[in-house]
């Protein structure tokens, strides 16, 4: 009985199409597959950013795979051929591994890259990114931002920079069609007469960096002698009501502070007949049903009632 062997895939490589972190892993079938013409060969692909503890593993019949990576670090990948047990009269046969690596050859000392990069998707409508210049760079240093997400033909450069002292320190993005719930890739590179500038790469999903507008139209309604219902409306914009969480801060007579987190646009408050003043503010955040993370809005304008006995009337702004 001769031992069945299979070769690893050929020409295994990582290809960078210029999408700022979205890379293609591709390969060719192994040599000498003639003996297994009736068989569907599979490939087990493992890949990771260098420094990551865990490998991502994919089993595929294709000759390519695409995924996103952190280009601030190197990438390593390995692949081998799998012959299913149906092809070998018994156990699965695996080839040896073919391995490859990819990294962007850096330039510039790390301190020259942008510092404190911060991106916020305001009200799920307007993306704004800001940064601080690298440490020790001169005023002649200018940074440029490029971005890509699936749906764009190629990476685009920012066309509306925020400037300070003649330097680009941020970008106001145009309307980004069909850009949420997918990886959004950014590269900020730079140039200087004085010294090379290190590029920085960032990846996030827009729905996870949304900062909504604050809620509006805050009102009070007396529900019973000891209950007041606080109400407000969702802010104008594209975010549906089902996507909001709210945090309320309530002050009674300048002493008691109540803080609560709710999912609806109402909150019922127990009060006493002695309550002379009631104030509350609300802020909003995209909830776990619509994103993995988010940023609290600013607090709403404060709504207060004071002067008359709260038990005697319905209170409206």
């Amino acid at each position: 009985d001769t031992e069945i062997k299979v070769n690893p895939p050929q020409d295994f490589e990582i290809v960078d199409p210029g999408y700022l972190g979205y890379l293609y892993l591709q390969w060719q079938p192994p040599l000498s597959l003639d003996h297994f013409k009736e068989c569907t060969v599979e490939y087990e692909l493992k890949y990771r950013n260098i420094g990551s503890e865990t490998w991502k593993t994919i089993i595929t019949k294709n000759l390519h795979y695409k995924d996103g990576f952190d280009l601030n670090k190197g990438i390593e990948a390995k692949i081998h051929t799998l012959l299913p047990w149906q092809c070998t009269n018994g156990s699965e046969v695996q080839s040896s591994w073919a391995e490859t690596t990819y990294w962007i050859s850096p330039q510039g000392i790390p301190e020259t890259k942008v510092q404190d990069m911060d991106c916020v998707y305001y009200n799920w409508q307007y993306l704004l990114c800001s940064w601080k210049p690298g440490i020790g760079v001169l005023l002649d240093t200018n940074y440029n931002l490029f971005y890509w997400y699936e749906g764009l033909d190629h990476a685009l450069q920012c066309v509306d920079y925020i400037k300070a002292d003649g330097q680009n320190i941020g970008c106001r993005f145009p309307y980004l069609e069909a850009s949420d719930y997918k990886d959004f890739y950014i590269c900020v590179n730079g140039s200087s007469e004085n010294k090379p500038i290190r590029s920085s790469y960032f990846t996030f999903q827009l729905q996870n960096i949304v900062k909504p507008l604050p809620p509006v139209y805050l009102t009070f309604t007396r529900e019973s002698s000891c209950e007041i219902k606080l109400k407000w409306s969702i802010p104008l914009g594209p975010i549906p009501a089902r996507c909001f969480d709210y945090e309320i801060e309530i002050r009674e007579d300048d002493t008691t502070l109540v803080t609560a987190t709710v999912e609806n646009e109402t909150y019922t408050l127990k009060t006493t007949n002695e309550t002379r003043q009631l104030c509350f503010v609300v802020r909003s955040k995209v909830n776990i049903y619509c994103s993995d993370d988010g940023i609290w809005s600013e607090w709403s304008d404060k709504q207060c009632w004071e002067g008359e006995d709260l038990s005697k009337k319905t209170l409206l702004r």
Epitope: G51, S105, P106, Q107, I109, P110, E111, I135, G136, K195
Partner: antibody
């Protein structure tokens, strides 16, 4: 196998010039940056500068005006041109490959002695 | 520039002894860019520990590194004769790149 071999060291008078070479094999200077680092006799290590894979250069500003780093990708070689040499430039000069923001392979070094 | 101060400057240890040397930076340095090199007399330096705690290829597991911010250390859990050398810390974060003045480790 990755190898870096420095050459061009020797005795030079104060005020003189010298050009050191670093021949790289087992990797390409178009893919990796290479640093020059020096070590005065019995002393510690001092960074001179780096030639990045893309061709740009970073220098130790204390030495920048007198030292120039260049490379020839076709020859896979790096060079350090040193002018207006002083006694305090006496040192072993090493070239070292840059890999993931560290220096992972070093040459054996070449000794430069500046003395009258 | 970032000044790296290594202590002690010279130390000796017996085989089997635990050894710790420190490196203090004058400014905060990212742990990603703090490395240690090992050098024996007449030889070129070798990368020993990279990014604070990762052992370079071929470095024995008795070596370890730790630290963050301005304070870093290299530890040998059990000294062996071949560990006698000078160890340099190095920061790759800020220009100019700098090295510590070295800790010379001798065999007692």
């Amino acid at each position: 196998e990755v190898q870096l071999v420095e050459s061009g060291g020797g005795l030079v008078q104060p005020g003189g010039s010298l050009r050191l070479s670093c021949a790289a094999s087992g990797f390409s200077l178009t893919k990796y940056g290479v640093h020059w680092v020096r070590q005065a006799p019995g002393k510690g290590l001092e960074w001179v500068g780096v030639k990045w894979a893309g061709g740009s250069t970073d220098y130790n500003s204390a030495l920048m005006s007198r030292f120039t780093i260049s490379k020839d990708n076709a020859k896979n070689s790096l060079y350090l041109q040193m002018n207006s040499l002083r006694a305090e430039d006496t040192a072993v000069y090493y070239c070292a490959r840059d890999h993931r923001d560290a220096m992972d392979y070093w040459g054996q070094g070449t000794l430069v002695t500046v003395s009258s | 520039q970032v000044v790296l101060t290594q202590s002690p400057a010279i130390m000796s240890a017996s085989p089997g002894e635990r050894v710790t040397m420190t490196c203090t930076a004058s400014l905060s340095v990212s742990s990603t860019y703090l490395h240690w090199y090992h050098q024996k007399p007449g030889s070129s330096p070798k990368l020993w520990i990279y990014s604070t705690s990762n052992l370079a290829s071929g470095v024995p597991a008795r070596f370890s590194g730790s630290g963050s911010g301005t304070s870093y250390s290299l530890t040998i859990s059990s000294m062996e004769a071949e560990d006698a050398a000078t160890y340099y810390c190095h920061q790759y974060h800020r220009s100019p790149l700098t090295f510590g003045s070295g800790t010379k480790l001798e065999l007692k």
